[in-house]
């Protein structure tokens, strides 16, 4: 999906308003400086990408993040403010559904919320450019 | 261990700039943030901004939006807080702290007094 | 920005005592407070992190609760090197704020 026509102000006051707190709620007890910041993005479209792609796409040791309340939100903004997103997601949500497992909140998947922050807090940069 | 070592105290006279400076060293340089904090005599601490040191990005507090200034020095992982305009509620001790994505502090340099009287 | 108050702000006490300290934000802040020990002429330590988590090398006697708008630090047995100054923070939301600190003296 190209998310270079999202409503990015949107998106961005979704996060602020309650994105942000799900996923400090998520890492809750972690500390500050557990993990090494190593995923970044350059612009709103290529960080979009990336919170996409680590929100929903299972990883090695990390399963089960698209059912946490910080990527239902997530997938609610990108299906609202980016047109056409909800039409490439069916597809993939009928696969993860298919695959759907108990939810265990491993290291792996802290330190994959961890590098979501990061990205997110790109993305609400001020000056970072559309494209 | 991580360490964060500070610049010594200055005393500026008003209306001047002071540029403080944080070595930081025991940790890879661009995995974290580095905020400053003040804390004037006998007060609390105020959160001046931070900046990430992989590509130096600032986000500052409004309070000291125009006035404050943090830059980077790769090559001797460095960050510096420039004050300028400075004036006498600006005497306070200056502090750099190191945080991951969640913004509480456990590494805290020495602090730098900073001096403003005429 | 949220405004974090502490409570009290002096606190006369005694070896051995209990002593509890307040932090109330003017909004939700889950658990995302940090509590700091702060003496003269050094930098703030590090206690405790999203509102009861133990620091490193924090003695037990050291507990923090709370969740929301309401927080607290308790010290169960008052020891002679911990007199000294409290500041809670959020790290809930940008700008990140600090109470205005609670020094704790010896009476």
């Known amino acids: 999906y190209d998310f270079t026509n999202c409503d990015f102000e949107k998106i961005k006051a979704a996060y602020l308003s309650t994105i942000s707190k799900d996923l400090i709620t998520y890492m809750s007890g972690t500390k500050s400086t557990e993990f090494n910041n190593t995923v970044s993005c350059s612009n709103r479209p290529h960080c979009l990408t990336e919170i996409q792609s680590l929100t929903f796409n299972p990883t090695a040791g990390c399963a089960s993040l698209a059912k946490e309340m910080f990527a239902m939100k997530t997938k609610a903004a990108l299906a609202i403010w980016c047109p056409g997103y909800s039409e490439t997601q069916i597809n993939a949500t009928q696969a993860m559904k298919k695959r759907r497992k108990r939810k265990v909140t491993t290291n792996k998947c802290l330190e994959q919320v961890s590098q979501l922050q990061g990205l997110w807090r790109r993305f609400n940069r001020p000056l970072l450019k559309q494209q | 261990q991580v360490q964060l070592v500070q610049s010594g105290a200055e005393v500026k006279k008003p209306g001047a700039s002071v540029k403080v400076s944080c070595k930081a060293s025991g940790y890879t340089f661009t995995s974290y943030l580095m905020h400053w904090v003040r804390q004037a005599p006998g007060q609390g601490l105020e959160w001046m901004g931070e900046i990430d040191p992989s590509d130096s990005y600032t986000d500052y507090n409004q309070n000291f939006r125009g006035r404050a200034t943090m830059t980077v020095d790769m090559s001797t992982s460095t960050v510096y807080m420039e004050l300028s305009s400075l004036r006498s509620e600006d005497t306070a001790v200056y502090y750099c702290a190191l945080t991951g994505t969640i913004n509480y502090f456990d590494y805290w340099g020495q602090g730098t007094l900073v001096t403003v009287s005429s | 920005d949220i405004q974090l108050t502490q409570s009290p702000s002096f606190l006369s006490a005694s070896v051995g005592d209990r002593v509890t300290i307040t932090c109330k934000a003017s909004?939700?802040?889950?658990?995302?407070v940090a509590w700091y020990q702060q003496k003269p002429g050094k930098a703030p330590k590090l206690l405790i992190y999203w509102a009861s988590m133990r620091h490193t090398g924090v003695p037990s006697r050291f507990s923090g609760s709370g969740s929301g708008t309401e927080f607290t630090l308790t010290i169960s047995s008052l020891q002679p090197e911990d007199f000294a100054t409290y500041f809670c923070?959020?790290?809930?939301?940008?700008?990140?704020?600090f109470g205005q600190g609670t020094k704790l003296e010896i009476k």
């Open positions: 923070q959020q790290y809930s939301s940008f700008t990140f704020t």
């Open positions: 909004q939700d802040v889950v658990t995302a």
